[in-house]
Interface confidence: low
C-alpha cells in the first residue's frame, strides 16, 4: 500500500510544529505540536522521550508515566492535578513536561 | 535490523545533474525524518539538509539551491543540481531522530554506508 | 548560522588514558549537541545525544557533558579499539526557521 504525500504510516508521528519562547531568563519553555497516525486504541503521546502512540487509556486517566516518557535511568512523577510529568536525571536534573 | 543503503553515485562531468538514493529496510521510511550528510575525501562531515515526513525541507545555507531533497514511498532521494568538482564526496543518508517533551535535539541514530560522487572532466 | 568550533583538531593518548573533546557553539542550543564516532571507510555511528544520553549499545566509558553552548566528550580509560575520528553535531528546531545542524571539524584519536 503506498501513501499518499504528507501521509503517515501507521503507528508512526510526527513533529508538525517545533518553537522555543526564551523571553524567561534561564528558562526555556519548549512547544511542539505532534502529529500521529496510530493504530485503533492508541494515540499520540511520548514514550522514550520521542514522540509515539500510546495506549489511550493513558491519556484519559492522565496516568502520564505509563506511557514510559522518560529516557532510560530517569525517574517520572505525575505533576499536580496530573498537569503532566517530570523526568528526573540520577544527577538530580529535574525536566518537567505540561501537557495542554 | 534497521538499515540504509545509498544508491547512485558515479562519476559524473561537472554540470550534468546526479540523483542519489536512499532505501530502507526493517522500517518504514515514510513516517521519519531524513537527512543527507556528504565527506569529501580526507575532510570532516557536512550537513546537507532534511525532509520531514510532510515532504517539507529544511537546507543548509551553503545547500540551498545546489541540492534537491525529495521523496517517494519508499526512497528519499538527493539530487544534485549542477555538480562542481567541489561536490566530490561521499554522501550519507542518516535517519533523523530526536527527543522531545522538552527538548528539539536532532541527531541521526541510523546511517548508510554511504556513496561514492566523483565529479570530474 | 551556527558554528560549532571542535578542540583539538587531533590528539594523542595511551591506553587508559582519559580523553576529553570539546564543542563550543556560537551560540545558546539547549543541549542539541550529539556526538558520532568515525573510523575509515565507515559511516558515523552514534555515542551521545541530547548532550549526555548515551546510545543504546556504546560502551560507558563514553559520556558527554554541557549546556548552553560549551560542551564536551569524555571517553574515560581509552581503549585500542577508540581510535578514531569524533564528530560534534548541534543544531536546533525551530518552527520559525526550521532545522540548522552543523558538525564540528573534528578531532582524529590516536592511540600510542
Known amino acids: 500500500q503506498f501513501l499518499k504525500e504528507g501521509q503517515l504510516a501507521a503507528g508512526t508521528c510526527e513533529i508538525v510544529t517545533l518553537d522555543r519562547d526564551s523571553s524567561q531568563p534561564r528558562r526555556t519553555i519548549a512547544r511542539q505540536t505532534v502529529k500521529c497516525s496510530c493504530f485503533p486504541g492508541q494515540i499520540a503521546g511520548t514514550t522514550r522521550a520521542r514522540p509515539a502512540c500510546v495506549d489511550a487509556r493513558i491519556i484519559k486517566t492522565k496516568q502520564w508515566c505509563d506511557m514510559l516518557p522518560c529516557l532510560e535511568g530517569e525517574g517520572c512523577d505525575l505533576l499536580i492535578n496530573r498537569s503532566g510529568w517530570t523526568c528526573t536525571q540520577p544527577g538530580g536534573r529535574i525536566k518537567t513536561t505540561t501537557v495542554s | 535490523q534497521e538499515q540504509l543503503v545509498e544508491s547512485g553515485g558515479r562519476l559524473v562531468t561537472p554540470g550534468t545533474p546526479l540523483t542519489l538514493s536512499c532505501t530502507a529496510s526493517?522500517?518504514?521510511?515514510?513516517?521519519?525524518?531524513m537527512s543527507w550528510v556528504r565527506q569529501a575525501p580526507g575532510k570532516g562531515l557536512e550537513w546537507i539538509g532534511i525532509i520531514y515526513p510532510s515532504g517539507s525541507t529544511d537546507y543548509a545555507s551553503w545547500a540551498k539551491g545546489r541540492f534537491t531533497i525529495s521523496k517517494t514511498s519508499t526512497t528519499v532521494d538527493l539530487k544534485i543540481t549542477t555538480p562542481t568538482t567541489e561536490d566530490t564526496a561521499t554522501y550519507f543518508c542518516?535517519?533523523?531522530?530526536?527527543?522531545?517533551?522538552?527538548?528539539?535535539?536532532?541527531?541521526?541514530?541510523?546511517w548508510g554506508p554511504g556513496t561514492l560522487v566523483t565529479v570530474s572532466l | 548560522e551556527l558554528v560549532m568550533t571542535q578542540t583539538p583538531p587531533s590528539l594523542s593518548a595511551s591506553v587508559g588514558e582519559t580523553v576529553r573533546i570539546r564543542c563550543l557553539a556560537s551560540e545558546d542550543i539547549y543541549s542539541g549537541i550529539s556526538w558520532y564516532q568515525q573510523k575509515p571507510g565507515k559511516p558515523p555511528t552514534l555515542l551521545i545525544y541530547g548532550a549526555s544520553n548515551l546510545e543504546s549499545g556504546v560502551p560507558p566509558r563514553f559520556s558527554g557533558s554541557g549546556s548552553g553552548s560549551d560542551y564536551t566528550l569524555t571517553i574515560g580509560g581509552v581503549q585500542a579499539e577508540d581510535a578514531a575520528t569524533y564528530y560534534c553535531?548541534?543544531?536546533?528546531?525551530?518552527?520559525?526557521?526550521?532545522?540548522?545542524?552543523?558538525f564540528g571539524a573534528g578531532t582524529n584519536v590516536e592511540i600510542k
Open positions: 542518516a535517519r533523523v531522530a530526536g527527543y522531545v517533551g522538552y527538548g528539539y535535539e536532532t541527531f541521526f541514530d541510523i
Open positions: 553535531l548541534g543544531g536546533v528546531t525551530y518552527s520559525s526557521t526550521g532545522t540548522h545542524l552543523t
Open positions: 526493517g522500517f518504514f521510511l515514510s513516517g521519519y525524518y
